[in-house]
């Protein structure tokens, strides 16, 4: 039994890191393999992650971690019984994929303005809380070409747009994702989408 693709890990910079790897053949990850991990820290202890299958030869492990700080470094040991298959390390701050924003809501009762709000996925004491920026994706269910991205580069988790920038009388969907420039993160997954019917009063044409 050998590792074909070494484990690569990403952290949510809070409490969970996800490691994925591939074996050289079909493997029952949960019965045959164990991923041991330990924070390099005077007061830490070793933990064991039981991997799950991710395709025939693929394995994935969800590592429960202490609250992350930038200096953290974890040792990783992949075992098959008594055989050490791979040894490595992982700095969560160097491989961050933020959590997805939540609670996306579209407020349509503000005079011809659409107000989209969502929740920051981190608690205020987490470093990423004040460093997230967002991308909001709005698209028409009727017209695949009516697809737009709004970049929200300020800290407030909200976006205002004029209802008239969208077509009236049709349904739209929106979703939001986050990233943090400070740690050069990847984008988060998209939030669940929310749907609304866009309608606004057309201004009277002056002749």
């Amino acid at each position: 039994m050998k590792v074909l693709q070494e484990p690569t890990c990403v952290s949510d910079y809070m409490s969970i890191s996800t490691c994925e790897w591939k074996m050289n053949g079909p493997t029952n990850c949960s019965t045959e393999l164990r991923l041991l991990y330990q924070l390099v820290f005077l007061l830490s202890e070793a933990h064991t992650c039981i991997p799950e299958n991710n395709g025939g030869a693929g394995c994935v492990c969800h590592l429960l971690m202490d609250d992350v700080v930038s200096a953290d470094n974890y040792t990783l040991d992949l075992w098959a019984g008594q055989q050490l298959l791979w040894k490595g390390s992982f700095k969560p701050s160097e491989h961050v994929k933020p959590r997805a924003p939540g609670n996306l809501t579209v407020h349509t009762n503000v005079s011809d303005t659409l107000l989209l709000t969502w929740s920051n996925p981190y608690p205020p004491d987490n470093y990423l809380y004040n460093h997230l920026t967002y991308a909001v994706n709005i698209w028409s269910e009727n017209d695949p070409a009516d697809f737009r991205i709004y970049n929200v580069t300020y800290l407030e988790p909200s976006l205002r747009i004029a209802a008239s920038t969208l077509k009236s009388g049709i349904s739209y969907r929106a979703r939001v994702r986050a990233w943090a420039q400070c740690y050069n993160t990847t984008w988060s997954e998209w939030s669940p989408s929310t749907k609304w019917h866009n309608s606004y009063r057309e201004p009277f044409e002056q002749h």
């Epitope: 830490s44 202890e45 202490d66 700080v69």
Partner: antibody
Framework: EVQLVESGGGLVQPGGSLRLSCAAS????????MFWVRQAPGKGLEWVSG???????SYADSVKGRFTISRDNAKNSLYLQMNSLRAEDTAVYYC?????????WGQGTLVTVSS | EIVLTQSPGTLSLSPGERATLSCRAS???????LAWYQQKPGQAPRLLIY???SRAPGIPDRFSGSGSGTDFTLTISRLEPEDFAVYYC??????????FGQGTKVEIK
């Protein structure tokens, strides 16, 4: 908002015992190492003890064998049992949250060891 | 045990002046594990700098940290009235644990 509130300080005779408590709120206590740091009157800061998320502990040489740090994750509480107290243990005792450094501190509780 | 020695013991300066505080370690300290704190009378310490040079959230940019190995520096570019306080450096070592310097008092001249 992160809050750390120490209690249990007071006047105790040399050789006596005292138990300090720290009530934590505003963060996930179980995922954080916790510490006690003290400061004698007019003196500098001295790290006393720390406890990891899994219960691993470490102590300064000056308190080893006399002090015991513990935690109750269900109660979001940190404790310091201090036995065989000496005059030189007189200090403000701070509860702190952190790891390699300490971003969050309580306001401290004063322990006076005197006859 | 790693010993941290801060100098000077006291620094007498006027508001608007530049303050340079030194912290010297008895053996090499990883940059990741060197921090600076400010403490005012009757208050708990406040983290200013971690990782030798990273400002903690909410700390004004007049505070900066630098250095590596055994020599570290905290610089306050222009002293404000609220900056007069005692400053401590602190290190963490995987085997020896946590130690603080003895402190530098920055007082009004």
């Amino acid at each position: 908002e992160v809050q750390l509130v120490e209690s249990g300080g007071g006047l105790v005779q040399p050789g006596g015992s005292l138990r300090l408590s720290c009530a934590a709120s505003g963060f996930t206590f179980s995922r954080n190492a916790m510490f006690w740091v003290r400061q004698a009157p007019g003196k500098g800061l001295e790290w006393v003890s720390g406890i990891g998320t899994g219960g691993a502990t470490s102590y300064a040489d000056s308190v080893k064998g006399r002090f015991t740090i513990s935690r109750d994750n269900a109660k979001n509480s940190l404790y310091l049992q201090m036995n065989s107290l000496r005059a030189e243990d007189t200090a403000v005792y701070y509860c702190a949250r952190g790891r390699y450094y300490f971003p969050w501190w309580g306001q401290g509780t004063l322990v006076t060891v005197s006859s | 045990e790693i010993v941290l020695t801060q100098s000077p013991g006291t620094l007498s300066l006027s508001p608007g002046e530049r303050a340079t505080l030194s912290c010297r370690a008895s053996q090499s300290v990883s940059n990741s594990y060197l921090a600076w704190y400010q403490q005012k009378p009757g208050q708990a310490p406040r983290l200013l700098i971690y990782g030798a040079s990273s400002r903690a959230p909410g700390i004004p940019d007049r505070f900066s940290g630098s250095g590596s190995g055994t020599d570290f520096t905290l610089t306050i570019s222009r002293l404000e009235p609220e900056d007069f306080a005692v400053y401590y450096c602190q290190q963490y070592d995987h085997s020896a644990g946590w130690t603080f310097g003895q402190g530098t008092k920055v007082e009004i001249k």
